[in-house]
Interface confidence: low
């Protein structure tokens, strides 16, 4: 025997109290598949969450985050604070990047400046909290007459200009 509930489409539920008639989902509830015996309560986007997609009888509401926050988790289950460029989010809120690190986005973490000397290059532009170091040509390439046996520049902290 076929389950009579299997005929109930999405947007309805199989109402046991009414002889298994397919009843429409009540307001603020939905069923996204057929054959459901109950409708699920719609998600409410409150506080730091805002509604990206309204709930319908066949699909749940979708939330995103208010300006200044971004989503974390499946289906935007959490909102995390944005920071400014040059900062990262810690447990105590937004903090400036430590010296020697940078973050060029409003989210994410501060990462170390590139160490130009590892690649045998000099620092062309110093790093900041918001921007990485820009590496220039290797010191040997700076003077046209430099011989190929020019010793490499001494290792420097990234972000410091060559002397």
């Amino acid at each position: 025997l076929q389950d009579p509930c299997s005929n109930c489409p999405a947007g309805t539920f199989c109402d046991n109290n009414r002889n298994q008639i397919c009843s429409p989902c009540p307001p603020n509830s939905f069923s996204s598949a057929g054959g459901q015996r109950t409708c699920d309560i719609c998600r409410q986007c409150k506080g730091v969450f805002r509604t990206r997609k309204e709930c319908s009888s066949t699909s749940n509401a979708e939330c995103d985050c208010t300006p200044g926050f971004h989503c974390l988790g499946a289906g935007c289950s959490m909102c995390e604070q944005d920071c400014k460029q040059g900062q990262e989010l810690t447990k105590k809120g937004c903090k400036d990047c430590c010296f020697g690190t940078f973050n060029d986005q409003k989210r994410g973490i501060c990462r170390p400046w590139t160490n130009c000397s590892l690649d045998g290059k000099s620092v062309l532009v110093n790093g900041t909290k918001e921007r990485d170091v820009v590496c220039g040509p290797s010191p040997a390439d700076l003077s046209p007459g430099a011989s190929s046996v020019t010793p490499p520049a001494p290792a420097r902290e990234p972000g410091h200009s060559p002397q």
């Epitope: 060029d104 986005q105 994410g108």
Partner: antibody, heavy 118, light 112 residues
């Protein structure tokens, strides 16, 4: 919907260069970094580098430093990865991926097979 | 560079049974914001990799709740409570804490 669409498969000779493109749609291109990852047969996924699609600066793995260049054209919402001095070791599927939240790659391109053969 | 080491490299599982994959990092992946920067990806045959878990234990959008991530120091675990046929593929862990981002060798999950 949000997607990254890459250019088609390419065959190159050793010593040549290859350019792979990655066109973004369905989101604000300049708001998310684009990374490039490759997978050679029998090898693990290998991170090559990334570009901040907003300001255009790029950072590369030391493994590819000097051979790889990642650029972007914001007007076309497209990122590019150029790899030079190709050898048979560069035969791989190359993927672009969007960095979503917390460094995770939430959207991937379909992959581009690059074959290096004399 | 941070080295990521996965085990096992091959994992035959009976459908409906649980599965567990381990990933160990050579350095601490804990950031001062309290999160571990460790992601899990599934690379299905003929498809692009897909994000399963990020920040050690947060499930990505659309990922079934049979997938879960846990962390203990430099040891990370991906658990599948009941393996389904569609879960077949190669699972990778990746650290996005330090450049270069690095992946584990991959764990091939196949059905018995």
């Amino acid at each position: 919907q949000v997607q990254l669409v890459q250019s088609g498969a390419d065959v190159k000779k050793p010593g040549a260069s290859v350019r792979v493109s990655c066109k973004a749609s369905g989101y604000t291109f300049t708001s998310y970094p684009i990374h490039w990852v490759r997978q050679a047969p029998g090898h693990r996924l290998e991170w090559m580098g990334w570009s901040n699609a907003g300001i255009g600066n790029a950072k590369y793995s030391q493994e590819f430093q000097g051979r790889v260049t990642i650029t972007r054209d914001t007007s076309a919402s497209t990122a590019y990865m150029d790899l030079s001095s190709l050898t048979s070791e560069d035969l791989a599927v190359y993927y672009c991926a969007r960095e979503g939240v917390a460094g995770a790659f939430d959207i991937w391109g379909q992959g581009t097979m690059v074959t290096v053969s004399a | 560079d941070i080295v990521m080491t996965q085990s096992p490299l091959s994992l035959p599982v009976t459908p409906g049974e649980p599965a567990s994959i381990s990933c160990r990092s050579s350095q601490n992946l804990l950031h001062s914001n309290g999160y571990n920067y460790l992601d899990w990806y599934l690379h299905k045959p003929g498809q692009s990799p897909q994000l399963l878990i990020y920040l050690g234990s947060i499930r990505a959008s659309g990922v079934p709740d049979r997938f879960s991530g846990s962390e203990s120091g430099t040891d990370f675990t991906l658990k599948i409570s009941r393996v389904e046929a569609e879960d077949v593929g190669i699972y990778y862990c990746m650290q996005p804490l330090q450049i270069p981002y690095t992946f584990g060798q991959g764990t091939k999950l196949e059905l018995k």
